[in-house]
Interface confidence: medium
């Protein structure tokens, strides 16, 4: 179920997945929620005396049991991911942090009259992930009322330092407040030849687009279908970027599909989850568990309720079926995507809906997934 | 162009920007170089502004923001709007511009081939539309020339999408069923070009459409192959008039 409480002066021991910098525990919790494997986190609001670089550290953690031993640590805040908290799921982070310099790669500096204006500039710049604004009281006159637009490979600050008269915050693209516009085009038989930031395995271009949308540095993508000539690249989704923010002219390529991230969309922004169940398809990955259920929908529901499950394969092969149902294999991987996709007539595969926003139906007890 | 991408310099060397210089100077329409002294464009570009002296024509340009008052431009010597064009009806949306002085051809500024009359039934598969127009219905003109590849739509199918309007045989339609890629405001008069048998041909002149890039609403273009006789006749009669008035 949903565990939203925070534990003050508590640090979870072990289970480390990744460490990043975040300005507060709420932002750390968000980062954990949208990380494919993170279930628990610990945030250091105060630094240990000899380790000043650990202040603002956000330590993302996982656990097979869903819990980790707690140790007392002054100034630490710990908690759970909100992966199973439906209505509380939002990547949007509107808070402004006074007296903090969130550092990253500064790619633009301009004069603005207010923090709001600076945040808007960041929100409306394709590359901007976070910003720092120097107020009119900042100690260096030449930087006063300056708005620094920033980015990093992780989408989060590379370090955070307390500095008087600096104010920092995040782009509001994830709040659907960007005015950049939203190119919905899907280009059949076209490939973009731009810089790859990552690659994942996906069953179709639409899942590829959603993965791109929620990747911090993906601006557009090219997906190679199952008919693609190079076997190792079949069902591979290449996440791409470019300096200009726009793709170079696409190359005509049979069995390639290209498109744009929807992270600047206001209305058409997708949820970070994939509803479709793919029949005749098997998703490979690390086996978490196998149960016997009746139907692929029930398998998806089981995966969704199993917090660590990221995707599943339901097999209708005679040897995989019993009286109580057929085999539902619950799986996971490091990036949340299958490690390989194969085509098997008797299989159906899909994804956990743990990151979908759910709405309570007023007249029935079951949760309806809002699509 | 909605759903397009940036072009590179010299990629579409026949594309020109038609601009109006009144109080300020603004890009109004596109056009295509078809000869040293000739630009082919849409008649509707001149609705309400049929005064040759306010128009400036820029060729060999990729980025409109780089145009300054020092940038060379061509002026209109003669504006020939199709005699049957009526502003309110959309047919015969074609115009020829004769330039004051002939253009120098370079790798960034050269003509596009016209189709032949026999090409009225040719099936084109690799077609592109270009322009500096809006990238969405409620947008603004772009600095960098945009391009998009777009499939042609048979006239019968196009007519079904536009029940309120008549799609004549002098029109050609192009667009995706699902929308998303199309010409838009400011692309008017510009080229719809198709590569056929290894060479680019001017198949259409951007004319009109219901909004831009809407689902089931293809762009409508003036079909150039239907006007080959008109184009040649106008160019020829202009040459003859020039000979009559020359001081020789």
């Amino acid at each position: 179920g949903c565990l939203s409480q925070l534990y003050a002066n508590t640090f979870f021991r072990g289970g480390d997945l990744a460490a990043i910098y975040t300005p507060d525990a709420q932002h750390c919790q968000k980062m954990c929620t949208f990380h494919p494997r993170c279930l628990l986190f610990s945030f250091l609001a105060v630094s240990p005396t000899k380790e000043t670089d650990k202040r603002f550290g956000c330590f993302m953690k996982e656990s097979i049991t869903g819990t980790l031993p707690r140790i007392h640590r002054t100034g630490a805040i710990s908690g759970h991911s909100l992966k199973q908290c439906g209505h509380q799921l939002s990547a949007c982070h509107q808070d402004i942090y006074e007296g903090l310099d969130m550092r990253g790669s500064n790619f633009n500096i301009s004069k603005t009259d207010s923090i709001e204006e600076c945040q808007k500039l960041c929100t409306n710049n394709i590359h901007c992930q976070f910003f720092t604004y120097a107020t009119k009281a900042f100690h260096r006159p030449e930087y006063r009322k300056s708005c620094l637009l920033k980015r990093s490979s992780s989408g989060t600050p590379t370090s955070i330092k307390p500095v008087d008269n600096l104010v920092s915050g995040f782009s509001l693209k994830s709040c659907a407040l960007s005015e950049i516009g939203c190119p919905m085009d899907i280009f059949q038989h076209f490939a973009f030849a731009d810089l790859n930031v990552s690659q994942v395995v996906t069953p179709d271009a639409f899942v590829c687009r959603t993965v791109c949308t929620f990747h911090p540095n993906c601006l557009f993508f090219t997906f190679y279908t199952n008919e693609w000539e190079t076997e190792s690249q079949r069902n591979v989704c290449f996440l791409k970027t470019s300096k200009s923010g726009r793709p170079s002219p696409p190359i005509i390529q049979e069995n390639a599909v290209s498109g744009y991230s929807l992270f600047t969309c206001r209305k058409a922004r997708p949820e970070p989850c994939h509803f479709k169940i793919y029949s005749g398809v098997a998703f490979e990955g690390e086996e978490l568990n196998a149960t016997f259920v009746q139907g692929a929908d029930a398998c998806q529901e089981t995966c969704t309720k199993t917090i660590r499950c990221q995707f599943f394969t339901y097999s209708l092969l005679p040897q995989d079926c019993k009286a109580e149902g057929c085999k539902c294999s619950l799986r996971l991987s490091t990036d949340g995507s299958p490690t390989r996709i194969t085509y098997e007539a008797q299989g159906s595969s899909g994804y956990s809906l743990r990151l979908c926003k759910v709405v309570e139906s007023s007249d029935c007890t079951t949760k309806i997934n809002a699509r | 162009i909605v759903g397009g991408t940036n072009s590179s310099l010299g990629e579409w060397p026949w594309q020109v920007s038609l601009q109006v210089k009144l109080v300020s100077q603004n890009h109004m329409c596109g056009g295509s170089i078809i000869g040293r002294q000739w630009i082919l464009t849409a008649a509707h570009c001149f609705d309400g502004i049929p005064y040759p002296d306010v128009w400036r024509i820029y060729g060999g340009i990729l980025n409109l923001s780089e145009i300054t008052n020092k940038t060379p431009f061509s002026s209109i010597k003669e504006l020939i709007i199709h005699q049957k064009y009526k502003m309110s009806e959309g047919s015969y949306d074609i115009a020829l511009i004769k330039l004051q002085t002939p253009l120098n051809y370079t790798e960034f500024q050269k003509p596009i081939c016209l189709p032949s009359k026999a090409d009225t039934n040719t099936i084109y598969t690799n077609c592109w539309v270009t322009g500096w127009g809006y990238t969405k219905e409620r947008g603004e003109t772009q600095n960098i020339l945009q391009k998009a590849t777009i499939p042609l739509v048979p006239n019968e199918e196009c007519q079904k999408k536009y029940r309120d309007y008549v799609i004549t045989k002098q029109m050609i339609c192009a667009g995706y069923k699902e929308g998303g890629i199309d010409a838009c405001k400011g692309d008017s008069g510009g080229p719809l070009v198709c590569k056929h048998s290894g060479r680019w041909q001017l198949v259409g002149i951007t004319s009109w459409g219901e909004g831009c890039a809407r689902k089931e609403q293809p762009g409508v273009y003036t079909k150039v192959a239907e006007y080959i006789d008109w184009i040649l006749e106008k160019i020829q009669s202009s040459k003859e008039r020039a000979l009559e008035t020359s001081p020789a």
Partner: antibody, heavy 126, light 107 residues
Framework: EVQLLESGGGLVQPGGSLRLSCAAS????????MIWVRQAPGKGLEWVSY????????TYADSVKGRFTISRDNSKNTLYLQMNSLRAEDTAVYYC???????????????????WGQGTLVTVSS | DIQMTQSPSSLSAFVGDRVTITCRAS??????LNWYHQKPGKAPKLLIY???RLQSGVPSRLSGSGFGTDFTLTISSLQPEDFGNYYC?????????FGGGTKVEIR
């Protein structure tokens, strides 16, 4: 020569109904959008309703929505405005106008009114 | 709805004077702006469409300009037949709305 001639106006009691007609000539009526615009005595112009060439799409001002219906008969070159539940504030001269198809800058919009009729007066009073 | 504000509401000028009427939209409307002239007891007549394009048959002493929210109609040399009311109208979005009008009188 383009001509538009309105008829059907007159005195009507609040809550009553009236049907205005606009006879068109001198142009291909079925190719144009048509519009009704009204003008209360001593006041400015107010757009009332709009209909596409085929009659397939209509729009109304909020002040008349649900009470007025625009329609056309392309075979008779006539535009209509059926006005029900009339109120005192509907008192005005009603003009029909032709929408110019603005085939301009790659946009097709009926968004200016290039020819107008002389108008017909509708008075709603008890 | 988009509000259209015209100014001045009335003016009086001599024949031969240059007259300027302004129209402001409550939100940007691109160049979707038209100007009409109406004489007392008569139907309105289209003068300018798309902010700056002159309707055929309209004398060239009239001109229009503007983009976004601010527009002007200029009569370079006022003539006796130019008296009456002038209205701007936006066609950016339904409901199409008119300005309140400017009454032009000849002194």
């Amino acid at each position: 020569e383009v001509q538009l001639l309105e008829s059907g106006g007159g005195l009507v009691q609040p809550g009553g109904s009236l049907r205005l007609s606009c006879a068109a000539s001198g142009f291909t009526f079925s190719a144009y959008s048509m519009i009704w615009v009204r003008q209360a005595p001593g006041k400015g112009l107010e757009w009332v309703s709009y209909i596409r060439p085929s009659g397939g799409r209509t729009t109304y001002a909020d002040s008349v929505k649900g009470r007025f219906t625009i329609s056309r008969d392309n075979s008779k070159n006539t535009l209509y405005l059926q006005m029900n539940s009339l109120r005192a504030e509907d008192t005005a001269v009603y003009y029909c106008a032709r929408g110019g198809l603005l085939l301009w800058f790659r946009e097709l919009k009926s968004n200016y009114f290039d020819y107008w009729g002389q108008g017909t007066l509708v008075t709603v009073s008890s | 709805d988009i509000q259209m504000t015209q100014s001045p509401s009335s003016l009086s000028a001599f024949v031969g004077d240059r007259v300027t009427i302004t129209c402001r939209a409550s939100q940007p409307i691109d160049n979707y702006l038209n100007w009409y002239h109406q004489k007392p007891g008569k139907a309105p007549k289209l003068l300018i469409y798309a902010a700056s394009r002159l309707q055929s048959g309209v004398p060239s002493r009239l001109s229009g300009s503007g983009f976004g929210t601010d527009f002007t109609l200029t009569i370079s040399s006022l003539q006796p037949e130019d008296f009456g009311n002038y209205y701007c109208q936006q066609s950016y979005t339904v409901p199409y709305t008119f300005g309140g009008g400017t009454k032009v009188e000849i002194r």
